[in-house]
Amino acid sequence: LKGQEFAPSHQQVYAPLRADGDKPRAHLTVVRQTPTQHFKNQFPALHWEHELGLAFTKNRMNYTNKFLLIPESGDYFIYSQVTFRGMTSECSEIRQAGRPNKPDSITVVITKVTDSYPEPTQLLMGTKSVCEVGSNWFQPIYLGAMFSLQEGDKLMVNVSDISLVDYTKEDKTFFGAFLL
Amino acid sequence: LKGQEFAPSHQQVYAPLRADGDKPRAHLTVVRQTPTQHFKNQFPALHWEHELGLAFTKNRMNYTNKFLLIPESGDYFIYSQVTFRGMTSECSEIRQAGRPNKPDSITVVITKVTDSYPEPTQLLMGTKSVCEVGSNWFQPIYLGAMFSLQEGDKLMVNVSDISLVDYTKEDKTFFGAFLL
Amino acid sequence: LKGQEFAPSHQQVYAPLRADGDKPRAHLTVVRQTPTQHFKNQFPALHWEHELGLAFTKNRMNYTNKFLLIPESGDYFIYSQVTFRGMTSECSEIRQAGRPNKPDSITVVITKVTDSYPEPTQLLMGTKSVCEVGSNWFQPIYLGAMFSLQEGDKLMVNVSDISLVDYTKEDKTFFGAFLL
C-alpha cells in the first residue's frame, strides 16, 4: 500500500503518502505575560494564546505550559516574531575610560527541549543592539527556519526581557510551527 | 478512493490526497505605487506585479486590484517584506518639556478581508520606530506566518506611508502565500 | 496511475502524488569565513556547515562550494538569516560641506545561478543602513520567500561585508530551502 508514482523516467517507491490537512500545525499569539521568577542567566519563556482569535493548534500539536509539544517526528518549519518596545536607550552616553558602553539589546531564542537530553538546544536566535535616543522605541525580531524534530520534543520562545515584549496585539507577537 | 497509508502501528484513513504541484501559490513583487487618494486614518494598500520577473500566481490563486484571492479553504503560509527608505528622522531632537518625542515609525500589515465580515482582520503586523540621524536611511520589515483561510478570503499588504516604500527592485519588497 | 481524489463536487485528476518526507531539503548553518578574494563590486558568498549540529541536507539536495544545488524542478521556500556585528558607525558624524554622509549599510542577497544563463538572479535582498553611535552594534537580517526553481539551479547567500558576519553560533546565521 505504499504510495507510488511515475518519476520522470522510472517508477519510484516513496514513503507512505499523507494528506496535508492532517499534519500537526500551530499558530500561537501573544498574551500579557504574568511576572514570574526565572533562573538567573536564563532567558524567560513566553506563554501564549492557543485557541482564541487567530491562534490554533491542530492534528495533535498541543500547547501546554509555554511549550509546543511535537506529536510526530519529521521536518518542521518553525517561526516567531516578537515585537519589543521600550524607552530611550543609554547606548550613546559618554563612554567612561574610553571604552564603548555595552549596548542595550533585545534577543529572541526559539529553544528545543528533549526530555532525554539534559540541555535545551537553541534552534534560532535573533539578537539586536538597541541604540535609540530621544524617544520611545519599538521594533520586531522575526525568525523562521526548518528543523528535524522528534516526537516528544518541546518548543518554546525565550526573550531577553519579558517586560519589553509588546503583548497588545495578536498580530505583533506570535509563534508557530507546522510539519512539512 | 481515499488516500491510505500505514501509520507507525496501524492503518489510518486520511483526508483525500493532493499533489503538491497543484496547490494555490503566489509570489508578488513590488511595482512603483502611483499616488492615489486613500481614506484618512487607514493605511494604504500596495499594488503588485503578478506575472513579470520573479512574480507568479498559479493553481487558481489570483491577483486583482491589490488583493490576493484565496481559491480554496486551508492553512496558508503568508509572507511579505517591505523595504522602506527615507531621510533623517527627527527623533533625536531636543525634547520639549522633558517629554520624549513621538518617534517616526514604519509599519507593514498583512490584512485579510472576508466579504461576509464587516471589518478587515489584521493577520500580521511589523512596526518599527525610526531614529536615524545625519543620513538617509533604509531598512526592511519582514513578516511571515501560517493562517487558516476560507475560500473567497482576500489578502492585502498595507503600509503606514506609501511614499517611503522602496519600489526599485523586485527582491526588496514582495508578498506571497501558498497552501500548505 | 495518476493520483486521484474527490474534489468537493467532482472527481479531479492531479499530478502524481509525492510523499513529503522524500522532498529535497536543507538547513545550513554558519561557519567562520576564511578570507578570500572576491571581485570588486560583487558581494562575497558565504560558505556553510551542512552536516554538523543543526545543519543537514537530504533527498538529493546537496551543498558544495558555497552553493545549494537544486536536484529537481519545483516551487521552493528559501530563507536565510545573517547576523551582523560591528563597531560604531560614522553616519551621524558632523557632515562636511553640508552634505549628508553616505550611510554605512549591511546587505544580504540570496542569489540564484543558472548555468545556461549568463547573469546571476537576485531572488531576495535585505538591506539596512547602520547608524549606531557610542557602542558596538549587532543585528540580524532575515529573508524568506517562495520561488520556482529548475533542476540544476544553484543558490548562494551573498553579503556586503563578510567581516561583519557573526559566525559564532549556528542559530544566529543560517540558510535553508525546501521543496513545497
Epitope: - | R32, T34, P35, K40, F84, G86 | -
Partner: antibody
Framework: ELQLQESGPGLVKPSETLSLTCAVS????????WAWIRQPPGKGLEWIGD???????NYNPSLKSRVTVSIDTSKNQFSLKLSSVTAADTAVYYC???????????WGQGTLVTVSS | DIQLTQSPGTLSLSPGERATLSCRAS??????LAWYQQKPGQAPRLLIY???RRATGIPARFSGSGSGTDFTLTISSLEPEDFAVYYC?????????FGQGTKVEIK
Amino acid sequence: ELQLQESGPGLVKPSETLSLTCAVSGVSFTDYHWAWIRQPPGKGLEWIGDINHRGHTNYNPSLKSRVTVSIDTSKNQFSLKLSSVTAADTAVYYCARDYPNFIYDYWGQGTLVTVSS
Amino acid sequence: DIQLTQSPGTLSLSPGERATLSCRASQSVSNYLAWYQQKPGQAPRLLIYGASRRATGIPARFSGSGSGTDFTLTISSLEPEDFAVYYCQQYAASPLTFGQGTKVEIK
C-alpha cells in the same frame, strides 16, 4: 557626491522637438526614478514626468501626448523629448532624483530652453 | 488635478523673526506634502517631506505641520540665507503638482 547635469540646445524653433539629456554621477543609477521638472521664467514649477532603469515612465497628463522620457543605463543618463513646442514651453528645465518616492531631493542646476523662431 | 494655493504671495520680515507660510490643497492629500526653497538662479532645495519630516541636512529652524488640506511651513527665526521663494508640492495623486510659491523678502 550625487551630481546631475542637464545638456541640450538652449534655443528651439516652434513646432520642433526639444531634446535634453541629464547625466548622473556619484550614485547607483538603478536605485531611483529620475524626473524632469520645468519652470517658466518668473513662474512656478511643473512636473513633466519620470523614468526608472527598466524604462518604466510616468507622465503629466497635460503633456503626455508630446513627451517622451528615455534612459540609457550604460551611460548613466536619461533624456527628455518634447515635440511640437510653442512659446509656452519656454522654461528652465531641471532634472532631479526622486527619493524616497515622488519627492525630489537632488536637482541639476537647470538649463534654459527658449522657444523662438 | 489637485490644486495647491499658497499664501501669502509675499511675506516681508526681518532676520530673527518667525515666518509662517501656508499651503492649502483643493482636496485631501493626507500627509503627502513637501516644501522646497528656491533662491534666484538656483534649483529648488527640498526642505520638508511627509508634511513634517525634515529632509537630510535641513536646519532645525525649519518645521512643517498639517494634514489633509491645510499645511504650514514655519521658520522659527529667519537667517539672512532664508530669504527666498518657497514652494509646496503634493504627491498624493498624479499628476504631482506644486503651489505657485510664497516669496519671503527682507523687510
